[in-house]
């Protein structure tokens, strides 16, 4: 029999979401206007294409990547879209308030939409650790808190460390991973007897998850190059990201086979490891001077990803309650750190090459930036986790975890869906 969406949530969710949407519309009405200076329509189209790539990554890529659960694939895709739509709206306002507001109204440009989409992507990475254990009302809270935390982190880093848009945004990998893991840590963990099958992957949803991985794989160069200032930097970023993800695919598939006693390939490893190179190369994608270095980085990232997928799920399942197939959180946490370390190595090479005494200071600044991102992620993640545990959200009972029928109307109610 169909599990009805709890009555309290039926009252709470539409009211909460629509009130929030009305508030956002009012904020847009009073505080925003469009950039009126668009002289070059060709440039507008080219600029929009980058934003479109990011939206495809978010909506299709991350939407489908998280859809591999046997009985939670609909919710994964649709909830991701819901969070993306809400997150982009709030991120545009927040970025405007934090950076432009003293001058009057917030000017909305294609660039601000690009930044907002990337901020919302952070939530979609984080939510992988909690999807299936929370309802939409809780996800609204998660979107608001995470986008706010990331926006403030970016502003603080920009003001204190003077980093540019790209370096600023590339903390997203580490931030999103640690935010998601700390939220997951706060949520009820044990799966009651008889529901273990729900967090298993199934063939059709796994295929759609692979489709998501393919979309991310194709568009990752756009993500890594979106906030770079000049054509040559973007070209370098696109090339290096492409080489890195290409190598991480080969590494992921062969490494997955190597890690299995019978030499079989794990879908879960592949879903996430194909992206490994893109994450690891992110911070320094425009700085890597030759393809072979990007390829080596892709290889190392692929190996780390497969190794992590093999040995970390047990620990994450026990401690954080994260199912075996939701490995994006710890994957991105390791690979994001690898990317940051690569940048610090470049800084060291820089200062050693120049033969000046600034090496320690520059490295300390970079470590400080990274530490700040992790601390804010953990603190805001724990805050979110505590908020999500409040009774008012009517969280799904543990027995209803990973169950589409709690949220969706299925006319035929096929039990094996």
């Amino acid at each position: 029999m169909s599990s009805k969406y709890p009555r309290s949530v039926r009252r709470c969710l539409p009211l909460w979401a629509l009130t929030l949407e009305a508030a956002l519309i009012l904020l847009f009405y009073f505080f925003t206007h469009y950039d009126a200076s668009l002289e070059d329509q060709k440039g507008l189209v080219a600029s929009y294409q980058v934003g479109q790539d990011l939206t495809v990554m978010a909506a299709i890529g991350l939407g489908f990547l998280t859809s591999s659960f046997r009985r939670h694939s609909w919710s994964s895709v649709a909830f991701n879209l819901f969070m993306l739509a809400l997150g982009v709206q709030w991120a545009i306002l927040l970025d405007g308030f934090l950076s432009q507001f003293p001058s009057g109204k917030v000017v909305i440009t294609l660039f601000s939409i690009r930044l907002a989409t990337m901020s919302a992507l952070s939530v979609l990475i984080s939510v992988d650790a909690v999807l299936g254990k929370v309802n939409l009302a809780q996800l609204v809270v998660m979107v608001l808190v995470e986008v706010t935390a990331l926006g403030n982190l970016r502003m603080v880093i920009s003001n204190i460390f003077n980093t540019d848009y790209h370096m600023n945004m590339m903390h997203i990998y580490v931030f999103a991973a640690y935010f998601g893991l700390s939220v997951a840590w706060c949520l009820p963990k044990p799966l009651p007897e008889g529901t273990e099958d729900k967090d298993q992957t199934a063939t059709i949803p796994s295929l759609s998850a692979m489709l998501g991985a393919l979309f991310l794989w194709m568009f990752w160069p756009s993500f890594n190059s979106a906030l770079l200032r000049s054509p040559i930097e973007r070209k370098n970023a696109v090339f290096n990201t492409y080489y890195a993800v290409a190598v991480s695919v080969v590494t992921a598939i062969s490494g997955s086979s190597l890690a299995h006693p019978q030499g079989k390939i794990s879908k879960t490893y592949v879903h996430s490891a194909v992206l490994a190179g893109g994450v690891a190369v992110g911070t320094s994608c425009h700085l890597i001077p030759s393809p072979w270095l990007a390829m080596v980085l892709g290889l190392v990232a692929g190996l780390i990803s497969v190794g992590g997928a093999k040995y970390l799920p047990g620990c994450c399942n026990r401690v954080l309650g994260i199912p075996h197939s939701s490995i994006m959180g710890y994957n991105f946490s390791l690979l994001g750190l690898l990317g940051e370390i690569i940048y610090i190595v470049l800084l060291v090479l820089d200062t050693v090459g120049a033969g000046n005494g600034m090496i320690g200071f520059q490295v300390l600044l970079s470590i400080g930036e990274l530490s700040l991102a992790i601390v804010i992620a953990l603190m805001s993640g724990l805050l979110t986790g505590l908020l999500l545990n409040l009774k008012i959200w009517k969280a799904p009972h543990e027995a209803k975890y990973f169950d589409d029928q709690v949220f969706w109307k299925f006319p035929h109610l096929a039990v094996g869906f």
């Epitope: 668009l38 002289e39 070059d40 440039g43 507008l44 080219a46 600029s47 980058v50 440009t109 294609l110 660039f111 690009r114 920009s158 003077n162 980093t163 540019d164 848009y165 200032r229 000049s230 054509p231 040559i232 930097e233 320094s284 425009h286 700085l287 001077p289 940048y343 470049l346 800084l347 090479l349 820089d350 090459g353 120049a354 000046n356 600034m358 200071f361 520059q362 600044l365």
Partner: antibody, heavy 127, light 106 residues
Framework: EVQLLEESGGGVAQPGRSLRLSCVAS????????MHWVRQAPGKGLEWVAD????????DYADSVKGRFTISRDNSKNTLYLQMNSLRAEDTAVYYC???????????????????WGQGTTVSVSS | AELTQSPSSLSASVADRVTITCRTS??????LNWYQQKPGKAPKLLIY???SLQSGVPSRFSGSGSGTDFTLTITSLQPEDFATYYC?????????FGPGTKVDLK
């Protein structure tokens, strides 16, 4: 081929009125470079005013002009613009456009330098 | 980052060695450029990234420094070098300029 920038549109304006400056590039394609406006008040130093990325996607402004000036570009016409609204006496200056040359000067980053400048156009704001 | 230059002006003779310093209010690594401006003319890029000489600029010009302290040195001043010199940081927007140092004939 000689790479040049040429500004136009300067003149005398009353406080509160508007002016639009143009900067035409020749000898190179504007679409490959970010661009800047820099001004110099009479007898004073250089002051950075605004910049725009190569594709027009992002713009930054000095606090003194934020909300009043708008930088834009038309790559198909190889032209950069500066729309100046609500002009004040302190906006009186020679306005230069400059090309943003991005150079890989370090292992850990790219640097901007202004390698080509226009000859400047004079804006005088007085009642 | 705010930039200060010293001296604000200096008088020198042809063939003199001239040193101009630029100090920033915060660490900018080596993201510093030097420009030369002659009266009624547009500025001209001399040095980028603190110490790299722009093509076409005579080798008597050199730059050094990192972090917060930078110097521009003209080893043997020539008649065409009498001008105003500006430092500029390009570490982050706004790309601020120093107040300038005027070099004139003693």
């Amino acid at each position: 081929e000689v790479q040049l920038l040429e500004e136009s549109g300067g003149g005398v304006a009353q406080p509160g009125r508007s002016l639009r400056l143009s900067c035409v590039a020749s000898g190179f394609s504007l679409r490959s470079y970010g661009m800047h406006w820099v001004r110099q008040a009479p007898g004073k130093g250089l002051e950075w005013v605004a910049d725009i990325w190569f594709d027009g996607s992002n713009k930054d402004y000095a606090d003194s002009v934020k909300g009043r000036f708008t930088i834009s570009r038309d790559n198909s016409k190889n032209t950069l613009y500066l729309q100046m609204n609500s002009l004040r006496a302190e906006d009186t200056a020679v306005y230069y456009c400059a090309r943003d040359w991005r150079v890989r000067a370090f292992s850990s980053g790219w640097l901007s330098a202004f390698d080509i400048w226009g000859q400047g156009t004079t804006v005088s704001v007085s009642s | 980052a705010e930039l200060t230059q010293s001296p604000s002006s200096l008088s020198a003779s042809v063939a003199d060695r001239v040193t101009i310093t630029c100090r920033t209010s915060r660490n900018i690594n080596r993201y510093l450029n030097w420009y030369q401006q002659k009266p009624g003319k547009a500025p001209k890029l001399l040095i980028y990234a603190a110490s790299s000489l722009q093509s076409g600029v005579p080798s008597r010009f050199s730059g050094s420094g990192s972090g917060t302290d930078f110097t521009l040195t003209i080893t043997s001043l020539q008649p065409e070098d009498f001008a105003t010199y500006y430092c500029q940081q390009s570490y982050s927007t706004p790309f601020t300029f120093g107040p300038g140092t005027k070099v004139d004939l003693k």
